[in-house]
């Protein structure tokens, strides 16, 4: 039985050219996290973080994606095209797969505040 919940940074905004941290957190389960996948809105993979083998950053993003903090991902040099949904998929044993959603809005405005708060999707 899957008892866990994924908490995410929810809906966040950041300014063009800036950076943002995409963060998910799995709670309320003793399941072992074996791998975390990060996907973009078009379902292309940004990165994989295997618990033992470390990070795999996809070539298309290697200059703009930094692993961490923790199981999260830092997206840098933001463009307007980065606006959209991001998904964290937690592969766990024995529970199975948990999935969280984050919506990122990239703003032109120089006064755009990077607002981020943890929430349960």
């Amino acid at each position: 039985m899957m008892t866990g919940t994924i908490e995410t940074t929810g809906n966040i905004s950041a300014k063009k050219g800036g950076s943002v941290i995409l963060q998910c957190h799995l709670s309320s389960t003793m399941a072992q996290v074996t791998q975390v996948n990060w996907e973009q809105h078009d379902h292309s993979l940004l990165a994989i973080r295997n618990a033992e083998l470390g990070w795999h950053i996809y070539p298309a993003f290697k200059d703009r994606v930094a692993p961490g903090p923790g199981l999260g991902l830092t997206l840098q040099s933001l463009t307007m095209n980065d606006t959209g949904e991001y998904f964290c998929t937690y592969h766990t044993y024995p529970d199975g797969t948990y999935r969280g959603r984050i919506f990122l809005e990239v703003l032109e405005s120089s006064v755009a505040e990077h607002s981020a708060r943890f929430q349960i999707p």
Epitope: Q35, E52, W55
Partner: antibody, heavy 119, light 107 residues
Framework: QVQLVQSGAEVKKPGASVKVSCKAS????????MHWVRQAPGQRLEWIGG????????SYSQKFQGRATLTVDTSASTAYMELSSLRSEDTAVYYC????????????WGQGTTVTVSS | DIQMTQSPSSLSASVGDRVTITCQAS??????LAWYQQKPGKAPKLLIY???YRYTGVPSRFSGSGSGTDFTFTISSLQPEDIATYYC?????????FGGGTKLEIK
């Protein structure tokens, strides 16, 4: 340049263990995950497992869990693969291979070590 | 485990021919796929990573494409030195698995 140099061929009896070494040069061994892949005669490549020398984490294929042990001696820039309870089906060429920095593809390979298990 | 089915298992082609090898994964692996070339008695060599990126120093006649479950490896104009066995490899999830190989021969 990057080089992975493996130990020589081994002949073992069924039930015995074998330990294959892989000496890395041309890069810092802690920066890349090291994997072991084997190839039985005429067969496909088979992933045994990988070790992240930086954090010491190991991942094994279920097939080899409990029978294979991957270790790294960072001071000697050498990775090791020990396989116990050998059987004839373990006769194969064993390769050490590293994954690219922040990638999982396997960019450099050792020359291979032939392990023959025969009574 | 993710099964990788490669086809054909062997093929014979002439110098200058366009050669295509396919690899099918038993489940979605996004673009977590690499292609290797192995010559007899030698270790494999990385040719293509992340499904479509040519590795450093690999000639432009080698290319890869695909995502999800279906992948293609192409040699645009076969050269005599391309005679080898080619393997696909998924690294989407452990245990990492390889295709059965495609042995390429010159007609």
């Amino acid at each position: 340049q990057v080089q992975l140099v493996q130990s020589g061929a081994e002949v073992k009896k069924p039930g015995a263990s074998v330990k294959v070494s892989c000496k890395a040069s041309g890069y810092t061994i802690t920066e890349n995950t090291m994997h072991w892949v084997r190839q039985a005669p005429g067969q496909r490549l088979e992933w045994i497992g990988g070790i992240n020398p930086n954090q010491g984490g190991t991942s094994y294929s279920q097939k080899f869990q409990g029978r294979a042990t991957l270790t790294v001696d960072t001071s000697a820039s050498t990775a090791y693969m020990e396989l116990s309870s050998l059987r004839s089906e373990d006769t194969a060429v064993y390769y050490c291979t590293r994954s690219s920095y922040y990638r999982y593809d396997l960019d450099y390979w050792g020359q291979g070590t032939t392990v023959t298990v025969s009574s | 485990d993710i099964q990788m089915t490669q086809s054909p298992s062997s093929l014979s082609a002439s110098v200058g021919d366009r050669v295509t090898i396919t690899c099918q994964a038993s489940q979605d692996i996004k673009t977590a796929l690499a292609w290797y070339q192995q010559k007899p008695g030698k270790a494999p060599k990385l040719l293509i990573y992340s499904a479509s990126y040519r590795y450093t120093g690999v000639p432009s006649r080698f290319s890869g494409s695909g995502s999800g479950t279906d992948f293609t490896f192409t040699i645009s104009s076969l050269q005599p030195e391309d005679i080898a066995t080619y393997y696909c490899h998924q690294h989407y999830t452990t245990p990492w698995t390889f295709g059965g190989g495609t042995k390429l021969e010159i007609k």
